[in-house]
């Protein structure tokens, strides 16, 4: 079976994947929106804000097929991808325009799923095998969480769901995807 690519509403090409897409990769190109060109945070943006509304998290819709071994969903499903780093909302548009991206040098901020929804899909199989019904877990919304280093980089601190919504009137821009991401394996990735 070949790679079937299709577009989402942010004009991003997404390969066909299994139940769960590969987590968004850490992009190596330091001029992408997920990296500061010179690393660290600029001194005039001290990391002291306590206002959750100052933090923004990007939600991109994308469409994919669900696979289970040789079987594939009759229709594609649409879900969200929680995009990259979180930073103060007031800095996001301008920072991108300058080719800069705010990123704290201390705690790491992650844009990760906030809520999931279940959707039943019908999987069609080759060779006359009976269709299979599966219920898949799809990302329904995203939020910013803080990753603190004193927790072995594994404990995520929730900034709350209020920070999870993209700002109104600003359509998310497509994320650059690395070659590695586009070569994600097509397997029965549940």
């Amino acid at each position: 079976q070949g790679w079937q690519a299709f577009k989402n509403d942010a004009t991003e090409i997404i390969p066909e994947l299994g139940e769960y897409p590969e987590p968004p990769p850490e992009l190596e190109n330091n001029k992408t929106m997920n990296r500061a060109e010179n690393g660290g945070r600029p001194p005039h943006h001290p990391f002291e804000t306590k206002d959750v509304s100052e933090y923004s998290c990007r939600e991109l819709h994308f469409t994919r097929y669900v696979t289970d071994g040789p079987c594939r969903s009759a229709k594609p499903v649409t879900e969200l991808v929680c995009s990259g780093q979180c930073g103060p909302a007031r800095l996001l548009p301008n920072a991108i325009g300058r080719g800069k991206w705010w990123r704290p040098s201390g705690p790491d901020f992650r844009c990760i799923p906030d809520r999931y929804r279940a959707q039943r899909v019908q999987l069609l199989c080759p060779g006359g095998e009976a269709p299979r019904a599966r219920k898949v877990r799809l990302v329904a919304s995203c939020k910013c969480k803080r990753l603190t280093r004193f927790h072995n980089q594994s404990e995520l601190k929730d900034f709350g769901t209020e920070a999870a919504r993209p700002q109104k009137g600003r359509k998310p821009r497509p994320r650059a995807r690395s070659a590695k991401a586009n070569q994600a394996e097509l397997e029965n990735a549940y």
Partner: antibody
Framework: QVQLVESGGGLVQPGGSLRLSCAAS????????LSWVRQAPGKGLEWVSV???????YYADSVKGRFTISRDNSKNTLYLQMNSLRAEDTAVYYC??????????WGQGTLVTVSS | DIALTQPASVSGSPGQSITISCTGT?????????VSWYQQHPGKAPKLMIY???NRPSGVSNRFSGSKSGNTASLTISGLQAEDEADYYC???????????FGGGTKLTVL
């Protein structure tokens, strides 16, 4: 074939810490949700924690604030850091792969004994 | 999440059929396609026997079947065999899809 192998269990005193590991092979690790499930001696199964493919983590109320689940996709390994251990945490701990909202593969388990 | 309720034990003779029930609230088993069953022999890891209420993984005997009516899911084993003697657990997920709940387990004895 899919394999999950737990390690790191042992005897620890109440209040102590332990880190369990689960080495995975035979599937694309980063694309799957993974859980820890435990079973106290002579008792039933109890779900402990799960990590999603995007780094999100979730816990049973009984371990929240004491246990931390994490994954290293580069090493195909799942971890469970257990702090402030109590006698009631004594159990065999299994890691399990979450497939379409059920567990299709389980490790053989590792025994954690909390006793003074 | 509220625990799922199973009978502590059931028994049957070889060749007979038995049914193990699993009852919960609507958020646990009231939704379609969300109950799985696991078999566990003493000292062994659990093994998935039924998923999505009534689907069998490859390699599981067709003597095992699942069903659901209202808030009660059931596992039926037909043509009982000695090797079926084990503990059986039902399981479902929480409303958030990020937590799980198991039944208390049922010990099956083949007489």
């Amino acid at each position: 074939q899919v394999q999950l192998v737990e390690s790191g269990g042992g005897l620890v005193q109440p209040g102590g810490s332990l880190r369990l590991s689960c080495a995975a092979s035979g599937f694309t690790f980063r694309s799957h949700w993974l859980s820890w499930v435990r079973q106290a001696p002579g008792k039933g199964l109890e779900w402990v924690s799960v990590t999603g493919v995007h780094g999100d983590t979730y816990y049973a109320d009984s371990v929240k604030g004491r246990f931390t689940i994490s994954r290293d996709n580069s090493k195909n390994t799942l971890y469970l850091q257990m702090n402030s251990l109590r006698a009631e945490d004594t159990a065999v701990y299994y890691c399990a792969r979450d497939t379409y909202l059920h567990f299709d593969y389980w490790g053989q388990g590792t025994l954690v004994t909390v006793s003074s | 999440d509220i625990a799922l309720t199973q009978p502590a034990s059931v028994s049957g003779s070889p060749g007979q059929s038995i049914t193990i029930s699993c009852t919960g609230t609507s958020s646990d088993v009231g939704d379609i396609n969300d109950v799985s069953w696991y078999q566990q022999h003493p000292g062994k890891a659990p093994k998935l026997m039924i998923y999505d209420v009534n689907n069998r993984p490859s390699g599981v005997s067709n003597r095992f079947s699942g069903s659901k009516s209202g808030n009660t899911a059931s596992l039926t084993i037909s043509g009982l065999q000695a090797e079926d003697e084990a503990d059986y657990y039902c399981s479902s997920y929480g409303e958030s899809l990020t937590s799980y709940v198991f039944g208390g387990g049922t010990k099956l004895t083949v007489l």
